[in-house]
Interface confidence: medium
């Protein structure tokens, strides 16, 4: 019996297919062949289906980089890992996705989902559109949507100081942010760590975090592979 | 244009009530937080509540925590402010004000207000 | 909650005049400030948005600056229109609190 989905365009399509163990995938943009991406599926959370673009969990990676670095990705999709607004772009393209955000702390966990997710094109400095919030760590996003992409060397903010090199990190900050999972690790001083403002404050940097995409239509997608 | 209009105010006995509302027009309602902020006179400004557009998400100063509800009604563009067990120090000038788009804490647009005096 | 402490309280200036009225935040609050201006009798008006953004139709002689605990509004040359009380206000966090305002008046 062949695929359903030959050329997987995310890790919902993957699971379509019957794969329902989360891990590295190839997915291929538009459905394109030439275009190959090699991504982590999140195959559990929240019926699975979820390509993971953020992770951090030990301070390994070091996630103070430039705007070319953050543009392409960098990091293991196993550990710690950015996988690059590049290719979040050209995923966000394909169909309307949701973002889901997932935090851990000592035994403690909190969730953000917003059903409309897009990031721009490198001509908009890869706008961040984010809508439709449900979940238990608080709505922190909100406050970055329609914000384009700062790092260091490239300060997109609304600030007179440039946030990213002010919080040692990169985010579409505006000035300067409630949501800075890209900081520094571990880092408690105000607003310098990995932070949710709107779950541990500013003062506090999270242990564990991951971003993650998928189609906003997955629920009925799945639904049908299941009657057929 | 963007406006908002207050009505409902008055003078009122301490211990009674009173229910604020405010009309919005020229944009779209659920999108943006809303809130009140009252100055009492001759005083400073000082935020009372707030609202999520959505409305699932309300806020209070403690100065009013338990006494006041704040309210939406998208379907009629409107804002409310229920006010019990009302005290002489309630006594203001309540504004309605429209959060900018985002988190919504920062008020781009306010109505003219509309006066609560609490007396006996 | 967030203290806001704002001086002076009075500033009697010359019309043409700098002004410069500064607001102290208890708390750091990175730049979730914002500025207003208020006409007796009337509404506040928002003139500065996180800390040093120009709200729409608000003259250039206008600016903010400052982050952390630290913020300042200029006004660089002072107009008759411009005599008016000054609040600065933190978004930072809820409640969202006020300075007790600037009176500037006539010297």
């Known amino acids: 019996i062949g695929l359903l989905y030959p050329f997987p365009r995310d890790c919902s399509q993957a699971m379509l297919n019957g794969d329902t163990t989360s891990g590295l995938y190839t997915i291929y943009i538009n459905g394109d062949k030439t275009q190959a991406l090699e991504v982590y599926c999140d195959m559990t959370s929240d019926g699975g289906g979820w390509i993971v673009f953020l992770r951090r969990k030990n301070g390994r990676e070091d996630f103070y980089r430039n705007w070319k670095a953050y543009a392409a990705g960098f990091g293991d999709r196993r550990e710690e890992f950015w996988l690059g607004l590049d290719n979040l772009s050209k995923i966000t393209a394909q169909g309307q996705y949701e973002l889901r955000v997932d935090l851990q702390d000592h035994g403690e966990s909190a969730y953000a989902v917003y059903d409309r997710f897009s990031v721009g094109d490198a001509k908009s400095r890869y706008k961040l559109k984010v809508e439709g919030y449900s979940g238990t760590a608080g709505d922190s996003m909100n406050y970055h949507n329609g914000r384009s992409f700062s790092t260091y060397d490239k300060d997109t903010d609304s600030a007179i100081t440039n946030c990213a090199l002010s919080y040692k990190g990169a985010f579409w900050y505006k000035n300067c942010h409630r949501v800075n999972l890209m900081g520094r690790y571990g880092d408690n001083n105000h607003s310098q760590g990995v932070n949710w403002f709107h779950w541990k404050g500013h003062e506090y940097s999270i242990q564990f975090a991951e971003m993650k995409l998928r189609p906003s239509n997955f629920r009925n997608l799945e639904g049908r592979r299941k009657r057929a | 244009q963007v406006q908002l209009v207050e009505s409902g105010g008055g003078l009122v006995q301490p211990g009674r009530s009173l229910r604020l509302s405010c009309a919005a027009s020229?944009?779209?309602?659920?999108?943006?937080?809303m809130h009140w902020v009252r100055q009492a006179p001759g005083k400073g400004l000082e935020w009372v509540s707030g609202?999520?557009?959505?409305?699932?998400?309300?806020y209070y100063a403690d100065s009013v925590k338990g006494r006041f509800t704040i309210s939406r009604d998208n379907a009629k563009n409107s804002l409310y402010l229920q006010m019990n067990s009302l005290r002489a120090e309630d006594t203001a000038l309540y504004y309605c004000?429209?959060?900018?788009?985002?988190?919504?804490?920062?008020?781009?647009?306010w109505g003219q207000g509309t006066m609560v005096t609490v007396s006996s | 909650d967030i203290q806001m402490t704002q001086s002076p309280a009075s500033l009697p200036t010359p019309v043409g005049d700098r002004v410069t009225i500064t607001c102290r935040a208890s708390?750091?609050?990175?730049?979730?400030l914002n500025w207003y201006q208020q006409k007796p009798g009337k509404a506040p008006k928002l003139l500065i948005y996180?800390?040093?953004n120009l709200e729409t139709g608000v003259p250039s002689r206008f600016s903010g600056s400052g982050s952390g605990t630290d913020f300042t509004l200029t006004i660089s040359s002072l107009q008759p229109e411009d005599f008016a009380t000054y609040y600065c206000?933190?978004?930072?966090?809820?409640?969202?609190?006020f300075g007790q305002g600037t009176k500037v008046d006539i010297k």
């Open positions: 609202i999520s557009g959505s409305g699932g998400s309300t």
């Open positions: 996180d800390a040093s």
């Open positions: 708390q750091y609050i990175q730049g979730f």
């Open positions: 004000a429209k959060g900018q788009k985002g988190e919504g804490d920062t008020f781009d647009i």
């Open positions: 206000q933190q978004s930072y966090s809820t409640p969202q609190t």
């Open positions: 020229g944009f779209t309602f659920d999108d943006y937080a």
